[in-house]
Interface confidence: low
Amino acid sequence: CKAMHVAQPAVVLASSRGIASFVCEYASPGKATEVRVTVLRQADSQVTEVCAATYMMGNELTFLDDSICTGTSSGNQVNLTIQGLRAMDTGLYICKVELMYPPPYYLGIGNGTQIYVIDPEPCPDSDF
C-alpha cells in the first residue's frame, strides 16, 4: 500500500436545508482508472463510514444503497455533496481515496472537513 496526499477544505457550513458540499482533491501518482472515495465522519473519537463510491476516471460517482451522498469527478478532484444533515451530524468529515486499479494500490486520507450544521428555526404556526 502506497501513500497519497489528499486535500480538502478545513471548514464548511451546511445550508439551511442541511446540504454541505466540499471538494476532495488527491495527488494521483499514476494513471488510475478505478477510484474509490469514502467519506468518514469522526465525532467523539468514533469514526463511522458515511458513504462510499467507486468510479471510473472521467465518469460519475455511483453511491449505493440510498446514500445521503452524491458526487461528481473531474480529473483528480471529487465534488462531494452530503444531504439530509441535522445539527447532530456536525463533525469532522474525512475524505479517503483509494486508487483501486491498475496496481499498485494507493491510499490517501485527508485531514477532514469540519462540517457545521445548524437546524433552522421552526416557523411559527400561522393563524388564518
Epitope: 474509490r36 462510499a52 467507486t54 468510479y55 471510473m56 472521467g58 465518469n59 460519475e60 455511483t62 449505493l64 444503497d65 440510498d66
Partner: antibody, heavy 120, light 106 residues
Framework: EVQLQQFGAELVKPGASVKMSCKAS????????MDWVRQSHGKSLEWIGN????????SYNQKFKGKATLTVDKSSSTAYMELRSLTSDDTAVYYC?????????????WGQGTLVTVSS | QIVLTQSPAIMSASPGEKVTMTCSAS?????MHWFQQKPGTSPKLWIY???ILASGVPARFSGSGSGTSYSLTISRMEAEDAATYYC?????????FGTGTKLELK
C-alpha cells in the same frame, strides 16, 4: 409497465464472441442504470457490471473486466453486453436488471435471461 | 469484495411451519436485499433494504438484521414459498449475491 426484453439462446464456439441485447420499455431508459448478472447452471448469481445509459459510464466487476463490454443505444432504449474469448466456463444464463434510486427499489425488474452455451 | 454466506444451503419445511434462513457478510453492510428464484425463471426482488417487502410479497415474509448478520423469516410456510432465496449487498462494489438457500416443501 416496465419490461426488459431479452432473447432466447446463443450457441457459440470456444474463443468466439457474443453480443446480447436487453430492450427496455415502460420507463425513461436514461433515468436508470442497467446491470447485468450471470447465473451458471445450478449456481448463484454474479454481478457483471452496470452502465449509465445517459452518460454511458460503466462499472465492472473486476472478474469480468476484459471479458464483458457494456454499451447502450439510447435511440432504441436497448442495452447490450458483448462477451469475448468465450470458454465453457462462460456457459450460463445472462440477465439484465434495472437499478433503482432513492425512490425505486433496485433490481425490481429483470429480463427473462439469455442462455449462452459455449461448445465446439 | 464482500462475501455473503447463506445457511442452510438446503432446508425443508412443512406447511404452516416457521422458516428462518440466514445470510452472513464477510464485512459490515448497510442493508441486505433478498431475491426469490424458482427453476427456469428470473430472480424476483423479494425483500429490500433489509426489511421492506417488495410489491406482491405476502406478509408472512419478514427480514431483519444489521452489520454482518441478516435473516429472512417465513412465519408460516406455504407450498408456493418453495424456491431458492438469495441475499445481496449493494454497500460496495462489486455487488455480490449470497450462495443461496434452497427451500423445499416437506
Amino acid at each position: 409497465e416496465v419490461q426488459l426484453q431479452q432473447f432466447g439462446a446463443e450457441l457459440v464456439k470456444p474463443g468466439a464472441s457474443v453480443k446480447m441485447s436487453c430492450k427496455a420499455s415502460g420507463y425513461t431508459f436514461t433515468d436508470y442504470n442497467m446491470d447485468w448478472v450471470r447465473q451458471s447452471h445450478g449456481k448463484s448469481l454474479e454481478w457483471i457490471g452496470n452502465i449509465n445509459p445517459n452518460s454511458e459510464s460503466t462499472s465492472y466487476n473486476q472478474k469480468f473486466k476484459g471479458k464483458a463490454t457494456l454499451t447502450v443505444d439510447k435511440s432504441s432504449s436497448t442495452a447490450y453486453m458483448e462477451l469475448r474469448s468465450l470458454t465453457s466456463d462462460d456457459t450460463a444464463v445472462y440477465y439484465c436488471t434495472r437499478d433503482g434510486n432513492r425512490y425505486d427499489a433496485w433490481f425490481a425488474y429483470w429480463g427473462q435471461g439469455t442462455l449462452v452455451t459455449v461448445s465446439s | 469484495q464482500i462475501v455473503l454466506t447463506q445457511s442452510p444451503a438446503i432446508m425443508s419445511a412443512s406447511p404452516g411451519e416457521k422458516v428462518t434462513m440466514t445470510c452472513s457478510a464477510s464485512s459490515s453492510v448497510t442493508y441486505m436485499h433478498w431475491f426469490q428464484q424458482k427453476p427456469g425463471t428470473s430472480p424476483k426482488l423479494w425483500i429490500y433494504s433489509t426489511s421492506i417487502l417488495a410489491s406482491g410479497v405476502p406478509a408472512r415474509f419478514s427480514g431483519s438484521g444489521s452489520g454482518t448478520s441478516y435473516s429472512l423469516t417465513i412465519s408460516r410456510m406455504e407450498a408456493e414459498d418453495a424456491a431458492t432465496y438469495y441475499c445481496q449487498q449493494r454497500t460496495s462494489y462489486p455487488l455480490t449475491f449470497g450462495t443461496g438457500t434452497k427451500l423445499e416443501l416437506k
